[in-house]
């Protein structure tokens, strides 16, 4: 029961985690910037992995997608790759874990097969969660190291003067969603791996052994069947024959003075 609960909970936690990773990957708020309060209106910028957006206090919002692949920063490409790998692994893990669930019966699937599938999905969830956490952390590190506070280093460009806009780059909501989702997927994966141990069948087979006392405990019943004492039922290897004949499992019982007809 505990194994089923652990497996089921691991599945649900991973499902929520992967949904979160997908949500974080699609979100636009990975990086948010408060672009100075200019004389017109408060301009708020935010960027995601796929597009950049501008929002103004007037209510105007516009987003533009990154239509080029080659020109984008390598870090952004790396984060995209990590998030996509996380989603793909997580999705495959979910698919595998559905069939591995103890509460779902598929044909004559053995417990050992379910245990292996549970372990496989658990490992996939762990890797998926790590990918998401790594992706979000790489992006966060990129913000911290490069953009935390842009300094107004002015230099001359071809068309005149160029300066970096005084902007404070902060962590967007997507980063927190990604961290939490990655963590949940990781926890779910660990739970699946723990459940796998409980699902694995024990390999110890105990042979039914019948113990008989010598002589005095063996009686011939009127019906001609020998009554056997001891532990275990006479269903596996033992047949009781008329006249008290022994089977291959039995030890010969010799008549004694206590025997009676």
């Amino acid at each position: 029961m505990a194994v089923t609960a652990c497996q089921g909970l691991g599945f649900v936690v991973s499902l929520i985690g992967i949904a979160g990773i997908i949500a974080a990957t699609c979100m636009d708020q990975w990086s948010t910037q408060d672009l100075y309060n200019n004389p017109v209106t408060a301009v708020f910028n935010y960027q995601g992995l796929w597009r950049s957006c501008v929002r103004e206090s007037s209510g105007f919002t516009e987003c533009r997608g990154y239509f080029t692949l080659l020109g984008l920063p390598a870090m952004l490409q790396a984060v995209r790759a990590l998030m996509i790998v996380g989603i793909v692994l997580g999705a495959i893990g979910l698919l595998v874990s559905i069939f591995a669930l103890k509460c779902i019966r598929i044909g004559s699937m053995e417990d050992s097969a379910k245990a292996n599938m549970t372990l496989t999905s658990g490992i996939m969830f762990i890797v998926s969660g790590l990918c998401a956490i790594a992706g979000v952390s790489v992006f966060a590190n990129m913000l911290v190291t490069n953009f935390w506070m842009s300094t107004a280093n002015m230099y001359t460009g071809m068309g005149g003067m160029v300066q970096t806009v005084q902007t404070r780059y902060t962590f967007g909501a997507a980063l927190f969603v990604g961290w939490v989702a990655g963590g949940l997927t990781l926890i779910g994966g660990v739970m699946m791996c723990i459940a796998c141990r409980g699902l694995a069948p024990e390999e110890t087979n105990y042979k039914a052994v019948s113990y008989h006392a010598s002589g005095h405990s063996v009686a011939y019943k009127p019906g001609g069947f020998k009554a056997s004492t001891g532990f275990g039922s006479n269903t596996k290897n033992k047949k009781i024959y008329d006249g008290g004949a022994r089977t291959e499992d039995e030890v010969q019982s010799y008549p004694s003075k206590h025997d009676y007809v």
């Epitope: 990086s31 910037q33 672009l35 200019n38 017109v40 209106t41 301009v43 910028n45 960027q47 950049s52 501008v54 103004e56 007037s58 209510g59 105007f60 516009e62 533009r64 990154y66 080029t68 020109g71 984008l72 920063p73 952004l76 990129m142 490069n146 953009f147 842009s150 460009g157 068309g159 005149g160 003067m161 160029v162 300066q163 970096t164 806009v165 902007t167 780059y169």
Partner: nanobody, 122 residues
Framework: QVQLVESGGGLVQPGGSLRLSCAAS????????MGWVRQAPGKGLEWVAV???????NYADSVKGRFTISRDNSKNTLYLQMNSLRAEDTAVYYC????????????????WGQGTLVTVSS
């Protein structure tokens, strides 16, 4: 490389009109706020007008009601329609634009043009 090129300046009589243009070119991803700043002879920089991507505008008190700022987002072009010009409007007019580049959409820069001279004299 990004360039901001102003045009339309020249000599005009008081009460006359001029239309300045500023064209931004290069590997621009998105232009945010654009504006006009002027520098009269022997004086400091004075902001004239600004416009956001969503067309919210604001003007310096000295030009309110006389100047109109506008932009064409699709062409990355900024305009300044100057009417009822006065002698005190004589200055070099610079356009500036807050933009990010296609190669790094996560960092914003302010680019400035070389300026165009407007002379109001009779």
């Amino acid at each position: 490389q990004v360039q901001l090129v102003e045009s339309g300046g020249g000599l005009v009589q008081p009460g006359g009109s001029l239309r300045l243009s500023c064209a931004a070119s290069g590997s621009i991803f998105m232009i945010n706020v654009m504006g006009w700043v002027r520098q009269a002879p022997g004086k400091g920089l004075e902001w004239v007008a600004v416009i956001t991507r969503g067309a919210s505008t604001n003007y310096a008190d000295s030009v309110k009601g006389r100047f109109t700022i506008s932009r064409d987002n699709s062409k990355n072009t900024l305009y300044l329609q100057m009417n009822s010009l006065r002698a005190e409007d004589t200055a070099v007019y610079y356009c500036n634009a807050d933009l990010n580049l296609a190669s790094d959409p996560f960092k914003w820069y302010t680019y400035w043009g070389q300026g165009t001279l407007v002379t109001v004299s009779s």
